[in-house]
């Protein structure tokens, strides 16, 4: 008969809290007669995990049927893993004896370490909105993972970004680790519909990375362009003037009409038209009364967008003599 060898193939076993861990042990001989036991740790303080011979171990099951004579597999499964289960596990063969069985040979041990999954990455954008062509920073954080090795990538609309810095803490030994990464993203005018994605890959995720996203719509402000135009047709003694507010984001917009410097109408944007790129358009109409006394009317369309400084566009109203006559004719 060959000399008994206790084989524990894994030096390190990563397990996740709540899952089941399988600890492998095979023997090369059935001799000597006696049980196989599993311990955590070594020396007099070692903890009995499983005894083939006796005892009640509710969390432990054997992988193979130990009642079969030719069985040489003494692997066990431990269910509902908790952080308290970490340590080095030894498969030990005993020789039948009295008053106690005699330890005959031990396996080399398998270290069980907590392979904690990282939390879902949380991506935070800048506190304030920024206009296109500027650079904004996004942070991505994930916590509670182990071991320390982890991979983090950034994407913008599926394209991998390269301008980012990542830190994993703590630098020394720990039960769990955290990762924080900051990416710098240059905003484009069309980024209202864009997304940044933070992707975290870890050994506990079995090749299925976790992703956190942030919409650039939360970070971007596209300022409007204004165009004020006088409509050729008039209604009675009134001329219609429009202020077209184009390509702005977000929706928040207040518009003020002034006539020769005097405020005469305030509006809050509603019933907006959405563009393909996610920006909005809005048109405001203003009716100006025409009379003989009014030769030089200057209209101003002033827009305050998303709490920023107001922008305005002026229009000097063109009132022809013919229009004045028409207007006079129409006056009762």
């Amino acid at each position: 008969e060959e000399e008994l060898q206790m084989i524990q193939p894994e030096k390190l076993l990563l397990v996740t809290v709540g899952k089941t861990a399988t600890l492998h042990c095979t023997v090369t001989s059935l001799l000597p007669v006696g049980p196989v036991l599993w311990f955590r740790g070594v020396g007099p303080g070692r903890e009995l995990i499983y005894n083939q011979k006796e005892g009640h171990f509710p969390r432990v099951t054997t992988v193979s049927d130990l009642t079969k004579r030719n069985n040489m597999d003494f692997s066990i499964r431990i269910s509902s893993i908790t952080p308290a289960d970490v340590g080095t596990y030894y498969c030990v063969k005993f020789r039948k004896g009295s008053p106690d069985d005699v330890e005959f040979k031990s396996g080399p041990g398998t270290e069980m370490a907590l392979g904690a999954k990282p939390s879902a990455p949380v991506v935070l954008g800048p506190a304030a909105r920024t206009t296109p062509e500027h650079t904004v920073s996004f942070t991505c954080e994930s916590h509670g993972f182990s071991p320390r090795d982890i991979t983090l990538k950034w994407f913008k609309n599926g394209n991998e970004l390269s301008d980012f810095q990542t830190n994993v803490d703590p630098t020394g030994q720990s039960v769990a680790y955290s990762i924080r990464s900051t990416a710098r993203v240059v905003l484009d005018p069309w980024d209202v519909r864009s997304q940044v994605i933070c992707e975290v890959a870890h050994v506990t995720l079995q090749g299925d990375p976790l992703r956190g996203t942030a919409n650039l719509s939360e970070a971007i402000r596209v300022p409007p362009t204004l165009e004020v135009t006088q409509q050729p047709m008039r209604v009675g003694n009134q001329v219609n003037v429009t202020c077209q507010v184009r390509k702005f984001y977000p929706q928040s917009l207040q518009l003020t009409w002034s006539e020769n410097g005097n405020v005469c109408q305030r509006e809050t944007a509603s019933t907006l038209t959405e563009n393909k790129d996610g920006t909005y358009n809005w048109t405001s109409w203003f009716l100006v009364n025409i009379s003989d006394q009014r030769d030089d009317v200057v209209l101003t369309c002033q827009v305050k967008h998303d709490g920023q400084l107001a922008v305005s566009k002026r229009l000097a109203l063109e009132v022809t003599v013919h229009q004045k006559d028409q207007s006079s004719d129409a006056t009762p």
Epitope: E1, Q52, E54, R69, N71, G97, S98
Partner: antibody, heavy 118, light 107 residues
């Protein structure tokens, strides 16, 4: 089905010899420690001999030097060669299988009667 | 050799009774103790090994306990088929030895 069937018992004169056989079915005999146990009429059980998986042999004091335990793997059989038989060897002889890891007896044969008498 | 002593040698009981048989070893045998049941004219049947583990197919009314030198076999509720002779056996070291037996009879 796991089974042990003994044969070879009978009447023999003191000083004579007898060879008991035990045919195993349903398992590989060589993978187990195997035993012979005897029981005199109206008496208790007495362990007689054992053979380990490595071929190591063991005997109770009263039969040492007279009895020989062996096995034939090809026939999946166990044997007990009994020489210099005495009246005190008269008993039913049982073939017994030892347990998987601790050698606890689990399977018993039906027994074969050996009578040593003149 | 390790001596095994059973008590009582015989025991009368009624159907439904709970009975306990004890077995004492002359030295520490760890828990390498087995119990067997034998009916007249039949081969012994293995009931318990390592003092408290039931062989497959053995009803749970049989239970064993003990370690070291003192052991017990308990039958929780006697049925007619349980009246037989019971033997304990140490198998920690050769020569394996049996107790003298306890004959359980119907009262």
């Amino acid at each position: 089905e796991v089974q042990l069937v003994e044969s070879g018992g009978g009447l023999v004169q003191p000083g004579g010899s007898l060879r008991l056989s035990c045919a195993a079915s349903g398992f590989t005999l060589s993978s187990y420690d195997m035993h012979w146990v005897r029981q005199a009429t109206g008496k208790g059980l007495e362990w007689v001999s054992a053979i380990g998986t490595a071929g190591d042999t063991y005997y109770t004091g009263s039969v040492k030097g007279r009895f020989t335990i062996s096995r034939e793997n090809a026939k999946n059989s166990l044997y007990l060669q009994m020489n210099s038989l005495r009246a005190g060897d008269t008993a039913v002889y049982y073939c017994v299988r030892g347990g998987v890891w601790d050698d606890a007896f689990d399977i018993w044969g039906q027994g074969t009667m050996v009578t040593v008498s003149s | 050799d390790i001596q095994m002593t059973q008590s009582p040698s015989s025991l009368s009981a009624s159907v439904g009774d709970r009975v306990t048989i004890t077995c004492r070893a002359s030295q520490d045998i760890n828990n390498y103790l087995a119990w067997f049941q034998q009916k007249p004219g039949k081969a012994p049947k293995s009931l318990i090994y390592t003092a408290s583990s039931l062989h497959s197919g053995v009803p749970s009314k049989f239970s064993g306990s003990g370690s070291g030198t003192d052991f017990t076999l308990t039958i929780s509720s006697l049925q007619p088929e349980d009246f037989a002779t019971y033997y304990c056996q140490q198998y920690v070291s050769y020569p394996y030895t049996f107790g003298q037996g306890t004959k359980l009879e119907i009262k």
